[in-house]
């Protein structure tokens, strides 16, 4: 059974993941220009359902394409460090949260970077609210 300390740790990790995803989304929405329109051509794969922590495997699998798009957007921009830091944070947090169980992602649809980040933000929020109620 999960201890109160492990539950608290999971909660903190979810809060951190949520924050990093929100930072990335804010960055993306700042590109209301030719860069955003390029970023929107990149496909991101979303699984059939995202309801459990093990489904974070599917987020992990899309982190490389995510970094690729954000690097394109920033180019020689000085904000590049923020992106790399957020991606790195997400990677570490996801590895902690998803556990060691192997999960095979069944991808259902392709979405834009904006939709992709929004959906994973919603996932974090729903898990956080479920665990705190």
């Amino acid at each position: 059974a999960p201890t109160s300390s492990s539950t608290k740790e999971t909660q903190e990790q979810l809060d951190q993941l949520l924050l990093d995803l929100q930072v990335l989304l804010k960055g993306v929405n700042d590109y209301k220009n030719s860069k955003l329109s390029r970023m929107l051509t990149f496909k991101f794969y979303m699984p059939k359902k995202v309801t459990e922590l093990k489904h974070l495997q599917c987020l992990e699998e899309e982190l490389k394409p995510l970094e690729e798009v954000l690097n394109l957007a920033q180019g020689k921009n000085s904000h590049g460090g923020n992106t790399r830091e957020s991606i790195s944070n997400i990677n570490v947090t996801v590895l902690k949260l998803k556990g060691s169980e192997t999960f095979m992602c069944e991808y259902d649809e392709t979405v834009t970077i904006v939709e992709f980040l929004n959906r994973w933000i919603t996932f974090c929020q729903s898990i956080i609210s479920a665990s705190s109620s």
């Epitope: 220009n33 030719s34 496909k43 690729e68």
Partner: antibody
Framework: EVQLVESGGGLVQPGRSLRLSCAAS????????MHWVRQAPGKGLEWVAD????????YYADSVKGRFTISRDNSKTTLYLQMNSLRPEDTAVYYC????????????WGQGTLVTVSS | SYELTQPPSVSVSPGQTARITCSGD??????AYWYQQKAGQAPVLVIY???KRPSGIPETLSGSSSGTTATLTISGAQEEDEADYYC???????????FGGGTKLTVLG
């Protein structure tokens, strides 16, 4: 209603220059990236260049890089294409277009202006 | 340089279904967009992000994508669907926009 109106086309000799304009109205011009697309007579569409909403980022097709310059004046809600060292193969109808919604599709197009490069 | 490949022409009888393909190495990772251009007119966006229709575009036009091929389908093709159709996307780097060569749709009859 969104309107894009191109002007500045005409007959020009090879090696000479021409500047095209695209007057925009009906939307917040300074909020959106803008594109130039051309179409040679009887041929397909070719993307030429695009510029970010604030003019800080510009991209060009290989065929025009170093000869054409895209720019914009947000206070005049106008897009420009400065075309130098013109070649006969630059002969085309030039359209300006914009991805008006949060999509990368070009939702709105002008009616085009014809540029003919010939001696 | 990156290319999107389309058949030059497609012909169908009225009421039949026409399928126009667009092939490109980057399409598994990039969305495709489709434009319809009628004679003497500016192009019109008919499909974006592989399969979405802008408002005002009839349901007879639909899009799909699988692997390196994007497909525009015109169901129950009519004379008014006669036009040139172009696919559009970005290259492998995502930096440059590219149009396919265009496909002339002819509705026989």
């Amino acid at each position: 209603e969104v309107q894009l109106v191109e002007s500045g086309g005409g007959l020009v000799q090879p090696g000479r220059s021409l500047r095209l304009s695209c007057a925009a109205s009906g939307f917040t011009f300074s909020y959106y990236g803008m594109h130039w697309v051309r179409q040679a007579p009887g041929k397909g569409l070719e993307w030429v260049a695009d510029i970010s909403n604030d003019g800080s980022n510009k991209y060009y097709a290989d065929s025009v890089k170093g000869r054409f310059t895209i720019s914009r004046d947000n206070s005049k809600t106008t897009l420009y294409l400065q075309m130098n060292s013109l070649r006969p193969e630059d002969t085309a109808v030039y359209y300006c277009a914009t991805p008006y919604y949060d999509s990368s599709g070009l939702d709105y197009w002008g009616q085009g202006t014809l540029v003919t490069v010939s001696s | 340089s990156y290319e999107l490949t389309q058949p030059p022409s497609v012909s169908v009888s009225p009421g039949q279904t026409a399928r126009i393909t667009c092939s490109g190495d980057a399409l598994p990772k990039r969305f495709a967009y489709w434009y319809q251009q009628k004679a003497g007119q500016a192009p019109v966006l008919v499909i974006y992000e592989d399969n979405k229709r802008p408002s005002g575009i009839p349901e007879t036009l639909s899009g799909s994508s699988s692997g390196t091929t994007a497909t525009l389908t015109i169901s129950g093709a009519q004379e008014e669907d006669e036009a040139d159709y172009y696919c559009y996307s970005t290259d492998n780097t995502g930096g440059l926009w590219v149009f396919g060569g265009g496909t002339k749709l002819t509705v026989l009859g």
